[in-house]
C-alpha cells in the first residue's frame, strides 16, 4: 500500500526537485567530461605561458566539476529512486548523502572564506589560462567560451598585463561590444573584477550557499518526512 | 633553420592589384602567428597585418584596411597578402615575418619582395 | 612622423660605446608593452637583436644591451665594430592607434 494525502504530495515533490538535481549534475558532469577529454582543452596540459609551464588551475577545476556533477547525479538518483519506489532503504542513504553534503558545504564554506585570496588568485590564473590558450590556439572554442563567459559574466575584459597580440586579439575578437581599452589596461579589469567579487562581494557567494544549505535541510526535511510517511504506511 | 622566401612582387599601376605569397620553412608553420612589414624606399618599417595561426583572427593597419586581405594556407606553409586598389604610397618592399607568442615580436624575417605602383 | 621617436643617426669609433634612444607615450612603451630593437644592415632584411626590453637572442653578442625606463627604451652598443654599422629600429605595440608601431630608424654609423 503506498502513502497518501500529504506525503503522496511530499513524495511527488522530492521526486521532481531530485530529477532536476540529477539533470543539473547530468549537465555539469558532462560539460566537465567535454572539457576534460576535448583536444582543444587537453591542449592547455601543454600550454606555455612565455618560458614557464602553464599551471594546472583549469584541470583541477574540471576535476572538481566532474566530482560535483557525479555526486549530484549520483544523490539525485537516491532521492528520485527512493521517493518513487517508496524505499526507507534509498531514502536512509539519501537522508546519509545529504548530511555528509552539508557538512561538507559548510567545510567548504569556513576553507573559501580562509583562502579567499588563494582562490581569487586560481580564478585570476584560470582566467589568464583560458585567455592565453584562445589566442595561442584560435580553433580552441572552448577556451574562447571560458573567456567569454568571464567577459559577460563580470562585465570585464583584460586584464592589466597583457601581450600586444592578445591586446589585438581581445580588442577584435573577444571583448564585450563597447569595452574601451585605456592605455594597457582594459576600461573594466578582469583581474580586478575577480578581487572584487571574492573581497567586496563575498555576501553575494555567502548568500548562493545559504540558499543551497537551505535547499538541503529543506530536502533533508522532506526525506525524514517521507520515510516516517512510508513507515507508518506499512504498518497499517 | 627557419626560411621565408617572399614572392609575387613587381610593377603595378596605380588602381592594380598584386598578390603577394611568402613560403615557409624550417619551424611548424601551421602552429604560428604570421604577419606582413613593409618599408617604403628609404623609409623606417610599418606593420600591415597578421593572421593567426588558424586564420581566425586577423588585423591591419589603418591604411590597409579594406584593401588588403591577409590569408594563409597551412597545408602548403604559405602566407599570402592580397593588395587592391594599390595606390602610389604602397610601393615599398614588403616583408614576411613570423610572429613569436611567447616574446611577442617579429623573431624572423624574409628577404621582401619590392612592389613598384606607379603609372 | 614615427609613433616612437629616434635620433636619425648616431655614430662612433670602433671600440667605443654608443646609446640610440627610443622615446614612446603612456599608450605604448609607458603601457607596459614590450620594446624590442631590430637590426636592418644595409641591403638586407631587419633581424631581432633585443626583444622584451633587454634580452638577446642567441647568437647575438653580449656587446647590445637593451633597457627601459617609462616611455623610453635604449638601445647601447659598446666595444663598437665596423659590421656594427647599421639602421637600428626599436618597436612596440601602441593601444590606442591598435597596432605594432616602429621608431624612425636610427643609422649608425661607425668612423675611422
Known amino acids: 500500500m503506498g502513502v497518501e494525502g500529504c506525503t503522496k504530495c511530499i513524495k511527488y515533490l522530492l521526486f521532481v526537485f531530485n530529477f532536476v538535481f540529477w539533470l543539473a549534475g547530468g549537465v555539469i558532469l558532462g560539460v566537465a567530461l567535454w572539457l576534460r577529454h576535448d583536444p582543444q582543452t587537453t591542449n592547455l596540459l601543454y600550454l606555455e605561458l612565455g618560458d614557464k609551464p602553464a599551471p594546472n588551475t583549469f584541470y583541477v577545476g574540471i576535476y572538481i566539476l566532474i566530482a560535483v556533477g557525479a555526486v549530484m547525479m549520483f544523490v539525485g538518483f537516491l532521492g528520485c529512486y527512493g521517493a518513487i519506489q517508496e524505499s526507507q532503504c534509498l531514502l536512509g542513504t539519501f537522508f546519509t548523502c545529504l548530511v555528509i553534503l552539508f557538512a561538507c558545504e559548510v567545510a567548504a564554506g569556513i576553507w573559501g572564506f580562509v583562502n579567499k585570496d588563494q582562490i581569487a588568485k586560481d580564478v585570476k590564473q584560470f582566467y589568464d589560462q583560458a585567455l592565453q590558450q584562445a589566442v595561442v590556439d584560435d580553433d580552441a572554442n572552448n577556451a574562447k567560451a571560458v573567456v567569454k563567459t568571464f567577459h559577460e559574466t563580470l562585465d570585464c575584459c583584460g586584464s592589466s598585463t597583457l601581450t600586444a597580440i592578445t591586446t589585438s586579439v581581445l580588442k577584435n575578437n573577444l571583448c564585450p561590444s563597447g569595452s574601451n581599452i585605456i592605455s594597457n589596461l582594459f576600461k573594466e579589469d578582469c583581474h580586478q573584477k575577480i578581487d572584487d567579487l571574492f573581497s567586496g562581494k563575498l555576501y553575494l557567494i555567502g548568500i548562493a550557499a545559504i540558499v543551497v544549505a537551505v535547499i538541503m535541510i529543506f530536502e533533508m526535511i522532506l526525506s525524514m518526512v517521507l520515510c516516517c510517511g512510508i513507515r507508518n504506511s506499512s504498518v497499517y | 633553420e627557419v626560411q621565408l622566401l617572399e614572392s609575387g612582387g613587381g610593377l603595378v599601376q596605380p588602381g592594380g592589384s598584386l598578390r603577394l605569397s611568402c613560403a615557409a620553412s624550417g619551424f611548424t608553420f601551421r602552429s604560428n602567428y604570421m604577419s606582413w612589414v613593409r618599408q617604403a624606399p628609404g623609409k623606417g618599417l610599418e606593420w600591415v597585418s597578421y593572421i593567426s595561426s588558424s586564420s581566425t583572427y586577423t588585423d591591419y593597419a589603418d591604411s590597409v584596411k579594406g584593401r588588403f586581405t591577409i590569408s594563409r594556407d597551412n597545408s602548403k606553409n604559405t602566407l599570402y597578402l592580397q593588395m587592391n586598389s594599390l595606390r602610389a604610397e604602397d610601393t615599398a618592399v614588403y616583408y614576411c615575418a613570423r610572429y613569436s607568442y611567447g616574446r611577442d615580436n617579429f623573431d624572423y624575417w624574409g628577404q621582401g619582395t619590392l612592389v613598384t605602383v606607379s603609372s | 612622423q614615427s609613433v616612437l621617436t629616434q635620433p636619425p643617426s648616431a655614430s662612433g669609433t670602433p671600440g667605443q660605446r654608443v646609446t640610440i634612444s627610443c622615446t614612446g607615450s603612456?599608450?605604448?612603451?609607458?603601457?607596459?608593452?614590450?620594446t624590442h630593437w631590430y637590426q636592418q644592415l644595409p641591403g638586407t632584411a631587419p633581424k631581432l637583436l633585443i626583444y622584451?626590453?633587454?634580452n638577446r637572442p642567441s647568437g647575438v653578442p653580449d656587446r647590445f644591451s637593451g633597457s627601459k625606463s617609462g616611455t623610453s627604451a635604449s638601445l647601447a652598443i659598446s666595444g663598437l665594430r665596423s659590421e656594427d654599422e647599421a639602421d637600428y629600429y626599436c618597436?612596440?605595440?601602441?593601444?590606442?592607434?591598435?597596432?605594432?608601431?616602429f621608431g624612425g630608424g636610427t643609422k649608425l654609423t661607425v668612423l675611422g
Open positions: 622584451g626590453n633587454s
Open positions: 603612456t599608450s605604448n612603451i609607458g603601457a607596459g608593452y614590450d
Open positions: 618597436q612596440s605595440y601602441d593601444t590606442n592607434l591598435s597596432v605594432w608601431v
